[in-house]
Amino acid sequence: DIIMRPSCAPGWFYHKSNCYGYFRKLRNWSDAELECQSYGNGAHLASILSLKEASTIAEYISGYQRSQPIWIGLHDPQKRQQWQWIDGAMYLYRSWSGKSMGGNKHCAEMSSNNNFLTWSSNECNKRQHFLCKYRP
């Protein structure tokens, strides 16, 4: 039998059963999540669940830019350092940079400082590029 790889929406890229959309629009975290949802297909700000997934995403984004942080779907809604993925994925894989936590920083970004492989926390009302994800 021929197994067809699912197709992603135009402008999105496919990796290991998921579609990813990198949006070079400046949005705060909650508006970015709403925009991801608006694309349908159950899309949310992206969860990153393994080093392999992180590396694939980082390589893709580096083809566009290497200097601006990017919102992902990890947040601390209770503001108690209890981080969770907005799409409900298990928070097992972690890739925080050394100086991530503290202050009024309850949303996570991929940091440009380490080629998007590590995360930092930031104030959720900052407007940044963002990454969406869905399973086709």
């Epitope: 070079r24 400046l26 705060n28 830019q65 601006q68 009302n125 900052k126 407007r127």
Partner: antibody
Amino acid sequence: DVQLLESGPGLVRPSQSLSLTCSVTGNSITSYYWTWIRQFPGNKLEWMGYIGYDDSNEYNPSLKNRISITRDTSKNQFFLKLNSVTSEDTATYFCAREDYDWFAYWGQGTLVTVSA
Amino acid sequence: DIVLTQSPVILSVTPGDSVSLSCRASQSIGNNLHWYHQKSHESPRLLIKYVSQSISGIPSRFSGSGSETGFTLRLNSVETEDFGMFFCQQSNSWPFTFGSGTKLEIK
């Protein structure tokens, strides 16, 4: 219809602070992002910064620590304060509504001259 | 900061002519490019958003194209009310920046 109107002194002394008010009608400033943009003699436009519906700010790094944008939601006004002005700050100052990325509504602009 | 370079600086045309205005970005900005028109002693007016998306109330003779670093605003059959300054603006990264403008003047 959304309307914005800038007001404030047309003449400011060097080293003093420039303070302007933007009065908004037809739209609550608790929606969208509200921006100050200035146009220098010769027509160059410079984005100065905004105050967001969520009270967030972003400023142009070129203005260093001289700029502050605040708001009064009860009066539906937002404000620009620019400290330590020089003749280089002589410009027409516009307030505008940012509709996520672009500027759909602008005030008429107010000329501010910095001179002794 | 992203620098937007507009050309030509001045364009002298006759009403009825069709013209193209260029805006070049110093780095890739995707489709985060918008165009404005400003008449003398007035505030700028949004013409085109996201490179090519039309704006309600703006005549269809204005159209935009391009991507990443190179963008064009086309005016089909220029009318007298079109004379003035044209600016491009990027919203890809902070700080937002504007081009230095193209002046469209009557020949």
